[in-house]
Every structure is written in C-alpha cells, then in structure tokens.
C-alpha cells in the first residue's frame, strides 16, 4: 500500500521540500502532540456492559515500542443484575494505527512503516441470526 | 527514543536509539491480514450503544480520511429497542499515529503525529454521586 502522491490540482511541490531518494520518504519521528494526555472517562473499561482488560505489548524494534491492546473480559454482556447475559455478545472495537518497524539485515538497518490493528475496547452487540448451512 | 538490541558483530558506531529522522520505504506493510473487516463493519448499528461515523478528511495527513464515531444516544438501547437512560453511551477514544506532511504540501516528507479519535461507543453504568 503506497502513500498517495499529492495531487497537482491541489498542491504544487514547494521548493522547500527536502530531496528524497526514489521509493522512499523522509520521516521525522519526533511526534507532534506527543505530550497531549487522553482524558479517558473514568475506568469505562470496568463500568462497561462489555468490560475489558488492557495488556501492553512491547517490541524494542518498533516505534512506539509500547502498544496497549484491550481484551474483552467476557463472551456475553453484563446485565443490570451484574450477571452475564449470553444472548448478547461482547465484541472488540478495533482501530488501525501506524508504527515504524526497525529491521536489521546483517549490519545494515532499514525502516518500514506498518499498519497495526489495535483493539481499543469492547461493545455489546446483538448477533445477526443468520445461520449458514 | 528506545533501545535496540544490536548484533554484537556489527561496528559500534550505530546508535542504540531510534534516530530522530529516518528514511522509510514508501510501501506500508499491513500486519492486519488475519482480520475480516466485514465482520465488524456494522457493529455501530447493532451495539446497545450505537454510533454514527463521521468522515474527517485532511489531505496533509496520511491516512487522509479518518472516521470518527459519535454516540447516537445519551442512554443505551434495551432489549425492547428503547433508549434506557439509566445507562450511558460513551465514546471509546484512542490515540493513533498518523503522518503529517512536513514541510506542508511536500509529497515525500512527513512527521509522525499523535491524534485522538473516537473509535466507537460502549454502554456504561453511570457513577452515581450521592450528595449529602
């Protein structure tokens, strides 16, 4: 999947653009908004009818090295009595994000952008009753 | 930066941390090959905390289109299909990394940017504060 070129109708390439070798791009990994903090609603992962836990995945050859993944706690959803309702299902909500992968080939190093699917949380759904024979 | 284990046989000049600027291949590797997007494509309608998806487009960013979730109701949908206001629909937010063209309008020069997106909604029990 290639990053789309800027359409000429919208932009002209400015003279100030840095020279870049063919087939690659220059990437500054000093993150814009690095210090913005998420004001997460208070522990929604425990108060949800489809509660979830968080696990941290760590990979030193990935930037960022830490990626947090959610895992639904139950198969069913939690009803008003605090019991699991198995006629409903807790399903994962997922979102793609980008990471930079560092690859070692012998003593040389290359960098590759990767799309990673992150499970963000869970929601309670009614399954489609659609039996396939 | 983060520390990288180095091949002990390699010259010692290599920096252990990720450099501030890197050259990366234009092709983006997709690790999500084992997922079926059709399966979750209509959770927004079938959830007890349904949401609408709004298109956020920015040609200076990659991906240029990001879909933002907005919860449809304050309450959650009960077994009878009615909105139950004893429960709350709340957005699930996630910080994701995108590419920002920098300098602006340049085709092959980017900077990573962290943005906050609402991915979907979940139904929660409200925290009840009893005022004495």
């Amino acid at each position: 999947r290639k990053i789309p070129k800027v359409g000429h109708t919208f932009f002209q390439k400015p003279e100030s653009c840095p020279p870049v070798p063919g087939g690659s791009m220059k990437l500054d990994i000093g993150i814009i908004n690095e210090n913005q903090r998420v004001s997460m609603s208070r522990n929604i992962e425990s108060r949800s009818t489809s509660p979830w836990n968080y696990t941290v995945t760590w990979d030193p050859n990935r930037y960022p090295s830490e990626v947090v993944q959610a895992q639904c706690r139950n198969l069913g959803c939690i009803n008003a009595q605090g019991k699991e309702d198995i006629s409903m299902n807790s399903v994962p909500i997922q979102q793609e994000t980008l990471v930079v992968r560092r690859k070692h080939q012998g003593c040389s190093v290359s960098f590759q952008l990767e799309k990673v699917l992150v499970t963000v949380g869970c929601t309670c759904v009614t399954p489609v009753i659609h039996h396939v024979q | 930066g983060i520390t990288i284990p180095r091949n002990p046989g390699c010259p010692n000049s290599e920096d252990k941390n990720f450099p501030r600027t890197v050259m990366v291949n234009l092709n983006i590797h997709n690790r999500n090959t084992n997922t079926n997007p059709k399966r979750s494509s209509d959770y927004y309608n079938r959830s007890t905390s349904p949401w609408n998806l709004h298109r956020n487009e920015d040609p200076e960013r990659y991906p240029s289109v990001i879909w933002e979730a907005k919860c449809r109701h304050l309450g959650c949908i009960n077994a009878d299909g009615n909105v139950d206001y004893h429960m709350n629909s709340v957005p699930i937010q996630q910080e994701i990394l995108v590419l920002r063209r920098e300098p602006p309008h340049c085709p092959n020069s980017f900077r990573l940017e962290k943005i906050l997106v609402s991915v979907g909604c979940t139904c929660v029990t409200p925290i009840v504060h009893h005022v004495a």
Partner: antibody, heavy 123, light 106 residues
Amino acid sequence: EVQLQQSGPELVKPGASVKISCKTSGYTFNEYTMHWVKQSHGKRLEWIGGINPNSGGVSYNQNFKGKATLTVDKSSSTASMELRSLTSEDSAVFYCARGGDGYYTNYFDIDYWGQGTSVTVSS
Amino acid sequence: QIVLTQSPAIMSASPGEKVTMSCSASSSVNYMHWFQQKSGTSPKRWIYDTSKLASGVPARFSGSGSGTSYSLTITDMEAEDAATYYCQQWNSHPLTFGAGTKLELI
C-alpha cells in the same frame, strides 16, 4: 471441512493437574469461540466455559471456576483446558466444541465437536 | 441456572413409528437446541433455534415449542435414529443441557 482434534486419554493421580488440547483446522480459528463440555459416565453434559480468541473474552460456569482454565494459542490454532486439584469426581470425557463468531451467530451457538478426551483420576 | 428436564428418560420405538420427546425449562427461554449422541461418539448438532435442522439431518425430524415447553419429533422412526438426544439452552448463563432422552429401537 471443520475438524477439532483432541489430545489423547489421560490417567492422573488425585491432586494433580492435567492440560488437554484441541487442535483445529478447516476454518479461521480466531473468529470462532471454543467451548469445553464435561460428560460423566456417558450421561449428562455439563458446560465448563468458552473462550473467543479474537475478542479475548472468556466465560465460565460458576461450578468450574477455579477448576478449569481455558487458553488459546492462535499461532497453532489450538485451544487448551487445564484442570487442577483433580479428584475422582473429575473423571469424565471432556469435549471441545466450536461456538459462534459473535457476528453471524451467537458465541454460545455450538455446532462442531471434538472426539473427546477421557480423563481418569485414580491413585 | 435454567434446569432442563427431558422426558421420558428412556423410550423405545419400532421402525415407521412416530416419536415425540419433550424438554421442559425451569424458566422461559427464547430458543431450544438439540444434539444427538450415539454410544462412544461425540454429540452432533441436530436441531437449532427450536426448529431449524442442522446440515445433513433427515427431514423426518422436526422441533417445536416456545416458552418453557419444547419437543423433538420423528415422523417415521428409522434404525439409525436410535441414540440419546439432549436439549440445550443458551438463553441464560450458564449454558445448560438436559439429562437426555435415550431412544431405543424395538
């Protein structure tokens, strides 16, 4: 063709633990739930619990909480169940059984079964 | 938990005979599901969502019922139908099975 291949029979001593496995083929392992069912003396079936590899969700019958632990290994498309602190009451045939995907069918909608693993607890 | 009571526990039928077995739930359920098990083999999905026949199940089988009362019927008993039939519900946690009805061939 959907297949659930369970590990072989086990003879274990009281107080010990046992782990039985269920290797799957013929479908996308991640997308479907795996349940475990106990059958004592060729009679009543008792649901132990289920696990969904994609969502990470698990659900246990209260009667088996602390007795059974369900896990999955996505890389080998294998589900496993560990039973601990075994007593003679735990002697039974244990089945893995595929449940729904939470999308087309409910997670608890069981369709395919493994051939069963016999566990005998005896000193 | 919902207790499923199957009756009769054991029954016999001749080839060609009509067979009906029942499953009573201690609380109302939306659907009932049935599994067939022959001696020494694993159970097979037989009827789901009260009345839908699983793939490969002969049309002589049918399921019906609602609320707390459900049944499985065979219009013309055949030798291969001799087995134990279990009803099952997943309307309420935990998922439960009945004790089974053993159907024997006369």
